[in-house]
């Protein structure tokens, strides 16, 4: 059996090498001699010779200064033989423990840690952490036991122990109150890390701490009165231009500027801030009226875009504006005029009378008449007194210049101010109809096949109005009916078929047809037919010669 | 019942006319147009022209145009074909038809053809 | 003016066979109407405006077509359809009837 005590060496011992470790010693030994080996890592394995064994006497030995923290274990296998090389014993594992020194200080992970607080933020605010490490043995002896500490703080204001460090974890934390970005923006600590609980080796690095901005400033109004003009009538005019500060950010929440109007419950105007330098600019929501109101006092009110993180109070302005008189428009009462009129309407009688106000009371102003659009020139206007009588006749029918029987008519007033003013008011004549269209066929040139023709439906089309318009009436006349007939094509007989009444040779006839309408306004209308060379439906043809009452004649 | 009469044959020598008849019956003869078609021994049919009965309108093929001449008369409900300077390739069955070119077609009646022999 | 041809110019059928005879037309047409011709008689009209049986014909012929190509179809040929068949446009001046074909029965 093997004889080993427990093996330990300390690191960095001195000379002189090599040194004693333990003797290691087999029991067979006093059955006869016994010669000792050792092998593995440190013997005869990298590295090579640092332990050797004095091989009669079992004295093992350590040949040079060990470093633990590159090897902190040795693992070695003891070995015994007799004099003529029998093992007497089986290999023995020995653990050769390298014992610790405090021969490594620690090292903080970074040179420059970097963390950020709000401004204003409470103590026991955590704002960052650093962290070191140390490569000594911190199982078995406090050689790696780093604690933390603040050597320096810049600025040292507004106290010179802002700051605070846990000794055990590098946590960071706000200690006094008083953290203000606009005052001090960014903080300075050189921090400290110390083996053996701080006692022992020690190094440095530096803590930079951004104070991040809140939102403890207001915007504050400078100059706080402010004088503008604007002609009346005129929206999204600039009146004038509304100046703060805010010490806060740049151009963060904090720092933008809303401005409020307290005072403006008609809507009357707007501020809108600049991007740029968060100016307030004052403009016209709607036009004013300068004959309701001709000064408006008006108080703003300057907060953020976010709110305020402390209570703080709102600056305010004042802003006297003064409207300006302009020459206005006559303004036509109602701006849009219907008056019904029946289409036979005497000439030269007066329809209507349509007038304007004249808007500037403060003025007195003539207003003259007269017509701006009158497309079929059916109306003339008395300059004087707006009086609106007939010129022509009036034609519901006239489709050019009637739309769903309405005539529009434009009538302009102007004024005698400086700059003359000119309104415009819209006459709708709606004209009721009367009988004076009779009914035409639609269309009017017709195509039949000379072999095996279709019918042609033909419709009736009368530019009146009900009951001025079907059912009609449809009849062949001047002797069309000898080779043509027609039937009505519908219930309310507004189409006809026309087809003839025998086969019929290629070329153009002439048939009268006759249609009245409901209330018995009749037109005898020609319709022009023409016979191709075809066989059944007939698209369009060449003409021939006409054909008096649907028969030809010879030429 | 609708009836195209023609005579069966008719013989006339090189150069010479004839003049080809169509007696009808049975339907009011200026209501409908009659057409004239020519069909040679063993060939198709050829069409040569028609006339309206009641106005004397007359329409022919351009390869005919020289050669036949249609005529009626009203009174007699016959229809005529003059054929002129005929050869041996006149020589061939016409035939009368009568057509409803107002309707679909569907009444078309034909005579029994008379053969035209030219021969010296 | 309008040529039709007719295709095939000669043909033979068996009893109950379907039989079809077309009819090309130079330019486009409107209807085409057929017409059967017997040796030694007048030509009937068959079919008029493209599809229209006329009075008398059987059922088993039937017509179709459009444009410039047109067709007679009898279902099941019989003995007594054998006959020549002739196509006729009348959709303009001059009145054109295809060459004929001849159908016999086998």
């Known amino acids: 059996d093997w004889v080993i005590p427990p093996i330990s060496c300390p690191e960095n011992e001195k000379g002189p090498f090599p040194k004693n470790l333990v003797q290691i010693k087999s029991n067979k030994d006093k059955e006869g001699k016994v010669f000792y080996s050792i092998t593995g890592q440190g013997a005869d394995t990298p590295p090579v010779g640092v332990f050797i064994i004095e091989r009669e006497t079992g004295w093992l030995k350590v040949t040079e200064p060990l470093d633990r923290e590159r090897i902190a274990t040795y693992t070695l296998f003891s070995h015994a033989v007799s004099s003529n090389g029998n093992a007497v014993e089986d290999p023995m594992e020995i653990l050769i423990t390298v014992t610790d020194q405090n021969d490594n200080k620690p090292e903080f992970t970074q040179e420059v840690f970097k963390g950020s607080v709000m401004e204003g933020a409470l103590p026991g605010t955590s704002v960052m952490e650093v962290t070191a490490t140390d490569a000594d043995d911190d199982v078995n002896t406090y050689n790696a036991a780093i604690a933390y500490t603040i050597l320096s703080q810049d600025p040292e204001l507004p106290d010179k122990n802002m700051f605070t460090i846990n000794r055990n974890t590098g946590v960071i934390s706000v200690v006094t109150t008083g953290l203000d970005r606009e005052s001090f923006p960014t903080y300075t600590l050189v921090v400290q890390a110390a083996d053996l609980q701080g006692e022992g080796l020690s190094t440095t690095a530096t803590a930079v701490i951004t104070v991040t901005d809140t939102n403890d400033n207001p915007p504050i109004f400078n100059p706080t009165t402010y004088k503008g003009q604007v002609p009346e009538n005129e929206a999204n005019v600039v009146i004038t231009t509304l100046k703060v500060t805010d010490a806060d950010a740049p151009n963060t929440p904090a720092w933008e500027a809303v401005y409020t109007i307290l005072n403006d419950d008609g809507g009357q105007f707007v501020v809108t801030t600049n991007p740029v330098n968060n100016d307030g600019i004052l403009k016209t929501a709607k036009g004013l009226d300068f004959e309701a109101k001709q000064q408006y006092i008006l108080h703003v009110a300057v907060t953020n875009v976010v709110p305020f993180e402390v209570s703080l109070t709102t600056s305010t302005a004042t802003v006297t504006v003064d409207v300006l008189d302009v020459n206005e428009a006559p303004i036509f009462v109602p701006p849009e005029k219907r008056v019904e009129v029946s289409e036979d309407f005497g000439v030269g009688q007066e329809i209507t009378s349509y007038t304007a106000q004249e808007p500037d009371t403060f003025m007195e102003q003539k207003i003259t008449y007269r017509i701006w659009r009158d497309t079929a020139n059916w109306l003339e206007i008395n300059p004087d007194t707006g009086a609106i009588s007939t010129r022509a006749e009036l034609d519901r029918e006239d489709f050019e210049h009637v739309k769903n029987s309405t005539y529009t008519a434009l009538i302009i007033a102007t004024d005698n101010g400086s700059p003359v003013a000119t309104g415009t008011g819209t006459l709708l004549l709606i004209l009721s109809d009367v009988n004076d269209n009779a009914p035409i066929p639609e269309p009017r040139t017709i195509f039949f096949c000379e072999r095996n023709p279709k019918p042609q439906v033909i419709n009736i089309i009368d530019a009146d109005l009900p009951p001025n318009t079907s059912p009609f009436t449809a009849e062949l006349t001047h002797g069309a009916s000898a080779n043509w007939t027609i039937q009505y094509n519908d219930p309310t007989q507004e189409s006809i078929i026309l087809k003839p009444k025998m086969a019929l040779e290629v070329g153009d006839y002439k048939i009268n047809l006759k249609l009245m309408d409901n209330q018995n306004k009749d037109q005898v209308t020609t319709l022009e037919v023409s016979v191709c060379d075809c066989e059944g439906a007939a698209g369009v043809c060449r003409k021939a010669q006409p054909v008096e009452a649907g028969l030809q004649i010879p030429a | 019942q609708v009836q195209l009469q023609q005579p069966g044959a008719e013989l006339v020598k090189p150069g010479a006319s004839v003049k080809l008849s169509c007696r009808t019956s049975?339907?009011?003869?200026?209501?409908?147009?009659i057409h004239w078609v020519k069909q040679r021994p063993g060939r198709g049919l050829e069409w040569i022209g028609r006339?309206?009965?009641?106005?004397?309108?007359?329409k022919y093929n351009e390869n005919f145009k020289n050669k036949a001449t249609l005529t009626v008369d009203k009174s007699s409900n016959t229809a005529y074909m003059q054929l002129s300077s005929l050869t041996s390739e006149d020589s061939a069955v016409y035939y009368c038809?009568?057509?409803?070119?107002?309707?679909?077609?569907?009444?078309?009646?034909w005579g029994q053809g008379t053969s035209v022999t030219v021969s010296s | 003016q309008i040529v039709l041809t007719q295709s095939p110019a000669i043909m033979s059928a068996s009893p109950g066979e379907k039989v079809t005879i077309t009819c090309s037309a130079s330019?486009?047409?409107?209807?085409m109407h057929w017409f059967q011709q017997k040796p030694g008689t007048s030509p009937k009209l068959w079919i008029y405006?493209?599809?229209n049986l006329a009075s008398g014909v059987p059922a088993r012929f039937s017509g179709s077509g459009s444009g410039t190509s047109y067709s007679l179809t009898i279902s099941r040929m019989e003995a007594e359809d054998a006959a020549t068949y002739y196509c006729?446009?009348?959709?303009?001046?001059?009145?054109?009837f295809g060459g004929g074909t001849k159908l016999e029965i086998k």
């Open positions: 038809t009568r057509e409803d070119s107002y309707g679909p077609f569907d009444l078309d009646y």
């Open positions: 049975g339907y009011s003869f200026t209501s409908y147009w």
């Open positions: 006339i309206v009965p009641n106005s004397g309108g007359t």
């Open positions: 330019s486009s047409v409107s209807y």
């Open positions: 405006s493209t599809s």
């Open positions: 006729q446009q009348r959709s303009t001046y001059p009145y054109t």
